[in-house]
């Protein structure tokens, strides 16, 4: 969470952003509020990138103004132009990609003053995992997959009766990239399971974390999947 | 409401340089969150973006046309135009303009089109 | 650049019918699809952005679906008006490609 405030004469306004991070491929939204303004057509919204001449988005007397805006950003981005009253300043963007991550820098000027506040953007791919029980194996094994995920990620299996022992043993691991040669998939499988027993597979990179767990019994399978993003907020 | 007419010749000869006009009407071509898209359409055939335009100028293009393709904007007449050079036969089409949405990008609305045909 | 397939080619419908069409993008395109109608001799109509919001003035009995890589449109009860050819558009990335349509004709 950033809180920036900005002087203009003896008005200032608090603009706050939020750390937040983009799955590539898809669409994301960079987060930024700002004191509401009634007044719609004072409000000046631009969206800046570190590194970047141009601007990534521009909002201004109720309408997007892109005609100063960087090529790597041209089609890709809008913002909530029915919220922006109410003080959402955040922007969409499309096809989110590798080289969009970095520092933003939203920036406001309404009729009550200015300000602005930076936002870290990460980039990467990260999805939920599958368990399932691999039935072709020679011995009883569970199957983790989850389809994209960059940068690397680790891999750790856990167990609620075996609990705080060490499965790299008993466990393979691959990945397996992409077609579009940024992204990779990843298969853990998991050997010499038990019954009446709940594992957990557990992948994480510096972006995102996401838990498969599965419950198998004699007579069902239970699976239940999260997935956390890490250092947002 | 918004509307957009094509004008242009209907025929020309092969190895030179096709040009058409849109107008738009109803609305301004200032107006900050479209793009002015190209679209055309071979008979009997699909459809194929040709590129866009921003009221600044600025524009992209279709990679597979880029080499033939000049899209440019007047907005004192509130006009944008399309230029492909080196025709063959292989363009003959109904070319239609559109706005596009600047994202969504969306066509809407569409021109009623105009059939050029490329034969000498 | 994306490809975009759309199925079946043609579709047989008898009037009051419900017709469901297939788009299917190359690689995920989220939900950066548009659908258009076209009759003959006429331009193309937005009916569909955002893989399933109406467009201003279209019919409820439209509606799209689906989401990456696998889209439908949908027509609850076919309307004589409906006889048409229907296009699905990605966004998602440039260049902006189309697919061959569908045909849906009267049974």
């Known amino acids: 969470l950033i809180i920036g405030f900005g002087i203009s004469g003896k008005h200032f306004i608090t603009v706050t952003t939020f750390t937040s991070a983009g799955n590539i491929g898809e669409d994301g939204t960079l987060s930024c509020t700002f004191e509401p303004d009634i007044k719609l057509n004072g409000i000046v919204i631009q969206w800046l990138k570190e590194g970047i001449k141009g601007l990534v988005h521009e909002f201004k007397e109720g309408k997007d103004d892109l005609s100063q805006q960087h090529e790597m950003f041209r089609g890709r981005t809008a913002v909530f132009a029915d919220q922006v009253v109410v003080g959402n300043a955040s922007l969409r963007l499309k096809n989110v990609q590798l080289t969009d991550a970095g520092t933003y820098t939203c920036y406001i000027r309404t009729s009550k003053g200015k300000g602005n506040a930076n936002l870290e953007y990460k980039t990467g791919a990260f999805s939920m995992p599958e368990i399932n029980v691999d039935y072709n194996a020679s011995s009883e094994s569970l199957r983790c997959e989850a389809p994209r995920w960059f940068p690397q990620p680790t891999v750790a299996w856990a167990s609620q009766v075996d609990q705080g022992a060490n499965f790299s043993e008993v466990s393979n691991t691959s990945f397996e990239l992409n077609s579009e040669n940024v992204t990779m998939k990843v298969v853990s499988v998991l050997y010499n399971v038990t019954i009446n027993n709940t594992y957990s597979c557990m992948i994480e990179n510096d972006i995102a974390k996401a838990t498969g767990d599965i419950k198998v019994t004699d007579s069902e399978v239970k699976r239940r999947s999260q997935l956390q993003l890490l250092n947002s907020g | 409401q918004l509307q957009l007419q094509e004008s242009g010749p209907g025929l020309v000869k092969p190895s030179e340089t096709l040009s058409l006009t849109c107008t738009v009407s109803?609305?301004?071509?200032?107006?900050?969150?479209?793009?002015w898209g190209w679209i055309r359409q071979p008979p009997g055939k699909g459809l194929e973006w040709i590129g866009n335009?921003?009221?600044?100028?600025?524009?992209y293009y279709n990679p597979s046309l880029k080499s033939r393709v000049t899209i440019s904007v007047d907005t004192s007449k509130n006009q944008f135009s399309l230029k492909l050079s080196s025709v063959t036969a292989a363009d003959t089409a109904v070319y239609y303009c559109?706005?596009?949405?600047?994202?969504?990008?969306?066509?809407?609305?569409w021109g009623q089109g105009i059939l050029v045909t490329v034969s000498s | 650049e994306i490809v975009m397939t759309q199925s079946p080619a043609t579709l047989s419908v008898s009037p009051g019918e419900r017709a469901t069409l297939s788009c299917r993008a190359s690689?995920?395109?989220?939900?950066?699809l548009a659908w258009y109608q076209q009759k003959p001799g006429q331009a193309p109509r937005l009916l569909i952005y955002?893989?399933?919001t109406r467009a201003t003035g279209i019919p409820a009995r439209f509606s799209g679906s689906g989401s990456g890589t696998e889209f439908t449109l949908t027509i609850s009860s076919l309307q004589s008006e409906d006889f048409a050819v229907y296009y699905c558009?990605?966004?998602?990335?440039?260049?902006?490609?189309f697919g061959g349509g569908t045909k849906v004709e009267i049974k």
């Open positions: 558009q990605q966004y998602h990335s440039f260049p902006f490609t």
């Open positions: 690689q995920s395109v989220s939900s950066n």
């Open positions: 335009i921003y009221y600044s100028g600025s524009t």
């Open positions: 109803g609305g301004s071509i200032k107006s900050g969150s479209y793009y």
């Open positions: 559109a706005r596009e949405g600047s994202y969504p990008n969306q066509f809407d609305p």
């Open positions: 955002g893989a399933s």
